[in-house]
């Protein structure tokens, strides 16, 4: 029986050109996390494998950085990055847990002040 729950950063509104961190956290289960996939729509952005570490998809290498933790940092945001992102936790013995985050990327004058963040 799958008892775990995924907590996410929550939906985010950010500025074009800025950076944001997408994070998920799996709780309420003792299952072992074997791999975390990050996807947008049907595109694979990155994989964090418990044994093999991180793999960033070649098409995102310039703008996606691994971490912090099992999270993902998106840099040099464009309006085209607007959409839904999925963290997919592969666990044993529970199976797969999925978290969802919607990211809205806006022109600089529109995005909220709280989302004008740059990764230090």
């Amino acid at each position: 029986m799958m008892t775990g729950t995924i907590e996410t950063t929550g939906n985010i509104s950010a500025e074009k050109g800025g950076s944001i961190i997408l994070q998920c956290h799996l709780s309420s289960t003792t299952a072992q996390v074997t791999q975390v996939n990050w996807e947008q729509q049907d595109q694979l952005l990155a994989i964090c494998n418990a044994d093999l570490g991180w793999h960033i998809s070649p098409s995102f290498k310039d703008r996606v950085a691994p971490g912090p933790g099992l999270g993902l940092t998106l840099q040099s945001l464009t309006v085209n990055d607007t959409g839904e992102y999925f963290c997919i936790y592969h666990t044993y013995p529970d199976g797969t847990y999925t978290g969802r985050i919607f990211l809205e990327v806006l022109e600089s004058s529109v995005a909220e002040h709280g989302a004008r963040f740059q990764i230090p």
Partner: antibody, heavy 119, light 112 residues
Framework: EVQLQQSGPELVKPGASMKISCKAS????????MNWVKQSHGDNLEWIGL????????SYNLKFKGKATLTVDKSSSTAYMELLSLTSEDSAVYYC????????????WGQGTSVTVSS | DVVVTQTPLSLPVSFGDQVSISCRSS???????????LSWYLHKPGQSPQLLIY???NRFSGVPDRFSGSGSGTDFTLKISTIKPEDLGMYYC?????????FGGGTKLEIK
């Protein structure tokens, strides 16, 4: 003036599919998300999903995945929702609603399209 | 999904009354950057829902200042300071922080 004009009421047979349109005017269509909301009997409001006209990206309430398909035609500033394999449970009023930038709210709503599924 | 609970279900009022509607969520609506996406809507019979308040406390364009929103975390309140005839209808809160967005069950504001 922002306006969302939806297609008219529909009476459809069980098992059929249908498409509702939502024509946007008075703003830059590709700059805002378009949401779809179901109002069923008992005044219940449910978010069906949204589409990003700029890139065609979608987000669905999993309850409606496989039931609703969202598309846009940028050239006519029109959003569409196709409802598949209709049953009596799908009888409702459906609204399109523009996403309010940066606050994940819905600022302008269409007038609603009433869908009745009956044989 | 985040469960949003509105109270009361029904609110009988007299014109001129001040009322409060409560909205509670099953988890915090603050995202990791401290932004909270909670909005309020009025749905009058035969009309489309209309946005009243967004981002907890911001009044939408054209909304009278007798409407105000407050709260944080999981507890939110809509206050109407002086009820007028045009305020009657169903009020809904909506959380937009977590996917999928979810509405409260609604509060019917009606005449006593």
């Amino acid at each position: 003036e922002v306006q969302l004009q939806q297609s008219g009421p529909e009476l459809v047979k069980p098992g059929a599919s249908m498409k509702i349109s939502c024509k946007a005017s008075g703003y830059s269509f590709t700059g805002y998300t378009m949401n779809w909301v179901k109002q069923s009997h008992g005044d219940n409001l449910e978010w069906i999903g949204l589409i990003v006209p700029y890139n065609g990206g979608t987000s669905y309430n999993l309850k409606f995945k496989g039931k609703a398909t969202l598309t846009v035609d940028k050239s006519s500033s029109t959003a569409y929702m196709e409802l598949l394999s209709l049953t009596s449970e799908d009888s409702a009023v459906y609204y399109c609603a523009r996403g309010l930038q940066r606050f994940y709210a819905m600022d302008y709503w269409g007038q609603g399209t009433s869908v009745t599924v009956s044989s | 999904d985040v469960v949003v609970t509105q109270t009361p279900l029904s609110l009988p009022v007299s014109f001129g009354d001040q009322v409060s509607i409560s909205c509670r969520s099953s988890q915090s609506l603050a995202n990791s950057y401290g932004n909270t996406y909670l909005s309020w809507y009025l749905h009058k019979p035969g009309q489309s829902p209309q946005l009243l308040i967004y981002g907890i406390s911001n009044r939408f364009s054209g909304v009278p200042d007798r409407f105000s929103g407050s709260g944080s975390g999981t507890d939110f309140t809509l206050k109407i300071s002086t009820i007028k005839p045009e305020d009657l209808g169903m009020y809904y809160c909506l959380q937009g922080t977590h996917q999928p967005p979810t509405f409260g069950g609604g509060t019917k504001l009606e005449i006593k």
